[in-house]
């Protein structure tokens, strides 16, 4: 337990005085927080948080879902924690099945354990399918299994958390990994026609096609040397995973001579930007 020199505020003291506690399902959880400036207990697991203003936290019949971090906080904002595992052979995992990973980043498969003493805490493919050979992980019984450096190829990967219990593999509910691609190139932009010659009063319509790995690509039509907002219409499609197409159509229903100029279709993503231009020349009716 923490010890601090007199006069300085010190963190609360928790009984039992250990960082981790293992109790069996059905047993009592009894945690005592000793501090003259006690404020509250907080319980956290996955996205759940509960508070208790009593300095003794008592759960008469512990369930697997009482597994988590119990933190006592005092009026100085100082805190101390104990992690409680409620060992339940019938419920080895707590799960939050949402699983999103950004390409090249780590992502957490949220399947914390209710028993830290099981072995072979790892990931398995669904229906006996193999996992990608290059997939790597770091296990944390209190949080789940971190997949390192998510690859685009892992998109829609179906997996389970797995442990061995009495020589047999026990699997969690299934997770489906959704990968958000990283931009590794500028968007690809093209225009329906590079130049237009119109008579005054005719309709000007030009389409810019923007292709990228996801719909978060930004695009706009701009008129060179002008801040005027142009009227555009959009159509978009996902042609399978990581193949997104947007068509931005710029229309001037009745072109005037002073509409002549260079119009630029501009697109950017976090990697960089690209643009393509089209030239409009409007001549009077004479």
């Amino acid at each position: 337990q923490p010890s601090v020199s007199p006069g300085e505020p010190s963190p609360p003291s928790i009984h039992p005085g250990k960082s981790d506690l293992i109790v069996r399902v059905g047993d009592e959880i009894r945690l005592l927080c000793t501090d003259p400036g006690f404020v509250k207990w907080t319980f956290e697991i996955l996205d759940e948080t509960n508070e208790n203003k009593q300095n003794e936290w008592i759960t008469e019949k512990a369930e697997a879902t009482n597994t988590g971090k119990y933190t006592c906080t005092n009026k100085h904002g100082l805190s101390n924690s104990i992690y409680v595992f409620v060992r339940d052979p019938a419920k080895l995992f707590l799960v939050d099945r949402s699983l999103y990973g950004k390409e090249d980043n780590d992502t957490l498969v949220r399947c914390p354990l209710t028993d830290p003493e099981v072995t072979n805490y790892s990931l398995k493919g669904c229906q006996g399918k193999p996992l990608p050979k290059d997939l790597r992980f770091i296990p944390d019984p209190k949080a789940g299994i971190m997949i390192k450096s998510v690859k685009r190829a892992y998109h829609r990967l179906c997996l389970h958390c797995s442990v061995d219990q009495e020589g047999k593999s026990v699997l969690s509910e299934k997770f489906i990994l959704k990968v958000r691609p990283a931009f590794k190139a500028v968007p690809v932009v093209s225009v329906s026609k590079a130049s237009y010659l119109l008579r005054e009063g005719e309709e000007f319509t030009v389409t810019c096609t923007i292709k990228d790995v996801s719909s978060s690509v930004y695009s706009t039509w701009k008129r060179e040397n002008s801040q005027t907002k142009l009227q555009e219409k959009y159509n978009s499609w996902h042609h399978g995973d990581f193949n997104y197409e947007r068509q931005a159509t710029l229309t001037i229903s009745s072109a005037r001579v002073n509409d002549s100029g260079v119009f630029m279709c501009y697109a950017n993503n976090t990697f960089g930007s690209a643009n393509v231009t089209t030239t409009l020349e409007v001549v009077d009716k004479g």
Epitope: P116, T119, N120, Y121, S122, L123, L131, P132, K133, L135, R136, F137, I138, P139, D140, P141, K142, M146, K148
Partner: nanobody, 125 residues
Framework: EVQLVESGGGLVRAGGSLRLSCAAS????????RAWFRQAPGKEREFVAA????????YYPNSMKGRFTISRDNAKNTVYLQMNSLKPEDTAVYYC??????????????????WGQGTLVTVSS
């Protein structure tokens, strides 16, 4: 770089025990996966046990469970392999391995980056 040094090997009678140590030095703070493999003459390198440095999760093949126990001492940056009820077929060179993270196929020796020189264990009948 990471250096791994194994010790504790030797000659032991069948039914006896040995404790192997693997001391790590260098940039070890980023290396979560620590494992033991063994290689008998003329055989493939075989997975024995592994441990997660941060969370303490342990990994064993079914064939080793019960007799072999892997543990760690964070203060000494050392991983241990306690081997009980040794049999002549446990005779092999025992290697320590490490990597930043566990491969999905954590029993595949080809997927670990850092290796020690090995320590010989001989079990006589």
């Amino acid at each position: 770089e990471v250096q791994l040094v194994e010790s504790g090997g030797g000659l032991v009678r069948a039914g006896g025990s040995l404790r192997l140590s693997c001391a790590a030095s260098g940039r070890t703070f980023t290396y979560d996966a620590r494992a033991w493999f063994r290689q008998a003459p003329g055989k493939e390198r075989e997975f024995v046990a592994a441990i997660s440095w941060s969370g303490g999760s342990t990994y064993y093949p079914n064939s080793m469970k019960g007799r072999f126990t892997i543990s760690r001492d964070n203060a000494k940056n050392t991983v241990y392999l306690q081997m009980n009820s040794l049999k002549p077929e446990d005779t092999a060179v025992y290697y320590c391995a490490a990597d930043e993270s566990f491969p999905a196929y954590y029993s595949d020796y080809a997927l670990y980056r850092y290796w020690g020189q090995g320590t010989l264990v001989t079990v006589s009948s």
